[in-house]
Amino acid sequence: ASFFGENHLEVPVATALTDIDLQLQFSTSQPEALLLLAAGPADHLLLQLYSGRLQVRLVLGQEELRLQTPAETLLSDSIPHTVVLTVVEGWATLSVDGFLNASSAVPGAPLEVPYGLFVGGTGTLGLPYLRGTSRPLRGCLHAATLNGRSLLRPLTPDVHEGCAEEFSASDDVALGFSGPHSLAAFPAWGTQDEGTLEFTLTTQSRQAPLAFQAGGRRGDFIYVDIFEGHLRAVVEKGQGTVLLHNSVPVADGQPHEVSVHINAHRLEISVDQYPTHTSNRGVLSYLEPRGSLLLGGLDAEASRHLQEHRLGLTPEATNASLLGCMEDLSVNGQRRGLREALLTRNMAAGCRLEEEEYEDDAYGHYEAFSTLAPEAWPAMELPEPCVPEPGLPPVFANFTQLLTISPLVVAEGGTAWLEWRHVQPTLDLMEAELRKSQVLFSVTRGARHGELELDIPGAQARKMFTLLDVVNRKARFIHDGSEDTSDQLVLEVSVTARVPMPSCLRRGQTYLLPIQVNPVNDPPHIIFPHGSLMVILEHTQKPLGPEVFQAYDPDSACEGLTFQVLGTSSGLPVERRDQPGEPATEFSCRELEAGSLVYVHRGGPAQDLTFRVSDGLQASPPATLKVVAIRPAIQIHRSTGLRLAQGSAMPILPANLSVETNAVGQDVSVLFRVTGALQFGELQKQGAGGVEGAEWWATQAFHQRDVEQGRVRYLSTDPQHHAYDTVENLALEVQVGQEILSNL
């Protein structure tokens, strides 16, 4: 049976076990694996791999027995190992692969394990003695019997028959995501100095998660996905969200080299060596990783994480997974394969997509253009100088290269003709008896951000043209509008004439044609990550941050962007936190990212907000955020009362007193007020922000946040002696906005 790192089987054991004859045969490459647990309230038997060694713990009544295999014999070597544990007549014996490893006397009492047997993992069992146990098994249990009875039957749907080939797959075998809920989890992706994630992606999914790494602080994460057929990366760090899109389409069923690079200053995603990166804005301070690196899918926690945050990801999108495969996976330069995965769901070893994607001819056209895919540009002087053979016509004296190259200048997103002046011959062609039509250009490597378009029949496919075509304006470069200011084409130039000339011209010379891109200022625009509707509770305030709206501007940093709120300034509901009552008609992108702004509702129908964002040169079209104010609904979540000794004090915590509201993504202020006199004590609040040792003061009102921070308590002040327990009825009312709930 195959266990994938998060699965287990359960077996009932209603009556006590007097004798134990347990036989397991397992194989795994993981040094940690929980093999079997027989669980009772106190009694238990645990078999696990820890650091590659088998450990057995048997607790019977008050006695505890521990056995383990020698440190030099590691059992996490993917080879099947047979373990036999017998407990008979007060004697426990452990043997592995036929060799006696340990034995010891044990109490004669039967093993009381009414919670049952857990094979391969402990499920949701939360018992004190399970703290620090190994991860669930990722590997195979070829056999498991207790007193001659199989523990592997019946199998549940997530534990598979046989031994899956993914457990023995080497790291050159692709990770196949066969869906619909595929997922592979690897050890955490650390990005302290810098982090890199590289793989070759083949998929037709237009929307799919690729990588997710949660951070140690609640809410931090790195997320890479396919969004509308393109790669997108999001880093959520503290208050700042960085969102990055790549323009290369990836959902075409062809292999694409993907690289994600992150450091403290910059995030870069590159597809087939076409990079997109953030400006050095410095919001990417170190993200302490928490949990596993998830590839190709999301678990429930990651889905929740993303839905709570700024991306406006729908639940369907987060529940979907990649359909396709990842090859040549490396994390921070270390190769990773299925064997290193901590857990997998619905995975296959190797790249087996839909049948039609894998017909041979699907790769035919890909092969034809493989030479055009940009790579790192070679660091060499081009062209290599040509040394003419002796005995050539005098025109070739001192000849080293055929052309003098000048940069092609193009406007961002514009077009420019390739002209004579860009590829000017160094010698007189007529004197060399060469015609312009015999000087043949071939594009051996295309530009990263544009295309050389040839207005010559059949030439576009061959990527070939002549110097005569250049003179006749048949070749023009079309830029794709991206922000990089430089690019280049690699041209191979050969001469097809049958006249005496240096052999290097017949073979061809390679030239780099630099392309200089004159930037064009792109106007910024406003995006609403969660949609253009915001809900607020009446008479409350709600933070306005990047989770509500953002500016998107490919060529401006946040520092250079300013928002304007359009409409009359009187009664404008947008304010700065530190300047209450003063309308904020204009604010910076930085202020928005820092969470300095709030929407304040003061009654009546909520006012919609129309914004414009400007980069100093151009402004975006206006964008409207529709705002709906709803009446607060308050519901008592907990009101349990307290028991305390006379003369003592006891904190009032959320477990004793808390309310819930109908706020949507809004942290509302909930005010409790005491409405009746207290007989036997007083309600107190701690001053100075709850600092240790700060004084407690009598209070008649406090906020739910004070309760959450442990800054509210009841102090019994009654000096009288009572023969019975006294009861203080604390009458409270709760206020949210202008809504009040009395008689709490």
Epitope: T15, G116, G123, T124, G148, R149, R153, P154
Partner: antibody, heavy 122, light 107 residues
Framework: QVKLQQSGGGLVQPGGSMKLSCVVS????????MNWVRQSPEKGLEWIAE??????????YYAESVKGRFTISRDDSKSSAYLQMINLRAEDTGIYYC?????????????WGQGTTVTVSS | DIQLTQSPSFLSASVGDRVTITCRAS??????LAWYQQKPGQAPRPLIY???YRYTGVPSRFSGSGSGTEFTLTISSLQPEDFATYYC?????????FGGGTKVEIK
């Protein structure tokens, strides 16, 4: 003396609902996995649902034919198992047995209730 | 789902006869198979588990054998109280399934 006492059968119209109960005595109920098995002349004996222990997170398994319509549950404090049936169909007609198994020797049914008849008919 | 086919469906025998009932599984179930006896108006009761182990209190004239896909229940000397319907059940995989039954009648 182990006893599984069933109640709650009867006549119900198609599309209707019904709840069956099973009270157990004679063994520690909270240690046993509980099941419901039904029997009809057309389909013979048919396992329909299983519920595990609190330690197993009350894991539930169902036959495909009843998934989404039947819910098995248990109340360890009352030593009782239940089968809530909604959207009943004519083919759900039969004798319903409450059964248990408790030991690692296999998922066979060592204790059975007396059975209760459910008739789905208009 | 694993199908269990019992044969014969009906069997007429006399007291003292040796009776053999066969259960064939549509796929390998190892020894994860049980046999039950049911009398009219009663619930089934377990006879054999793990293909060959007698349940507590079951007389020794009942025996089970087989593994994989072929199983047999044998009653070595049929007694008057043995006239009933017998069912096999597999617990190798979900859903748990039963055979169609073999009715043993008095000849």
């Amino acid at each position: 003396q182990v006893k599984l006492q069933q109640s709650g059968g009867g006549l119900v119209q198609p599309g209707g609902s019904m709840k069956l109960s099973c009270v157990v005595s004679g063994f520690t109920f909270s240690n046993y996995w509980m099941n419901w098995v039904r029997q009809s002349p057309e389909k013979g004996l048919e396992w329909i649902a299983e519920i595990r222990l609190k330690s197993n997170n009350f894991g539930r398994y169902y036959a495909e034919s009843v998934k989404g319509r039947f819910t098995i549950s248990r109340d360890d404090s009352k030593s009782s198992a239940y089968l809530q049936m909604i959207n009943l169909r004519a083919e759900d007609t039969g004798i319903y047995y409450c059964t248990s198994y408790g030991n690692y020797v296999g998922h066979y049914f060592d204790h059975w209730g007396q059975g209760t008849t459910v008739t789905v008919s208009s | 789902d694993i199908q269990l086919t019992q044969s014969p469906s009906f069997l007429s025998a006399s007291v003292g006869d040796r009776v053999t009932i066969t259960c064939r599984a549509s796929q390998n179930v190892d020894t994860n198979l049980a046999w039950y006896q049911q009398k009219p108006g009663q619930a089934p009761r377990p006879l054999i588990y793990s293909a060959s182990y007698r349940y507590t209190g079951v007389p020794s004239r009942f025996s089970g054998s087989g593994s994989g896909t072929e199983f047999t229940l044998t009653i070595s000397s049929l007694q008057p109280e043995d006239f009933a319907t017998y069912y096999c059940q597999q617990y190798n995989s979900y859903p748990l399934t039963f055979g169609g039954g073999t009715k043993v009648e008095i000849k």
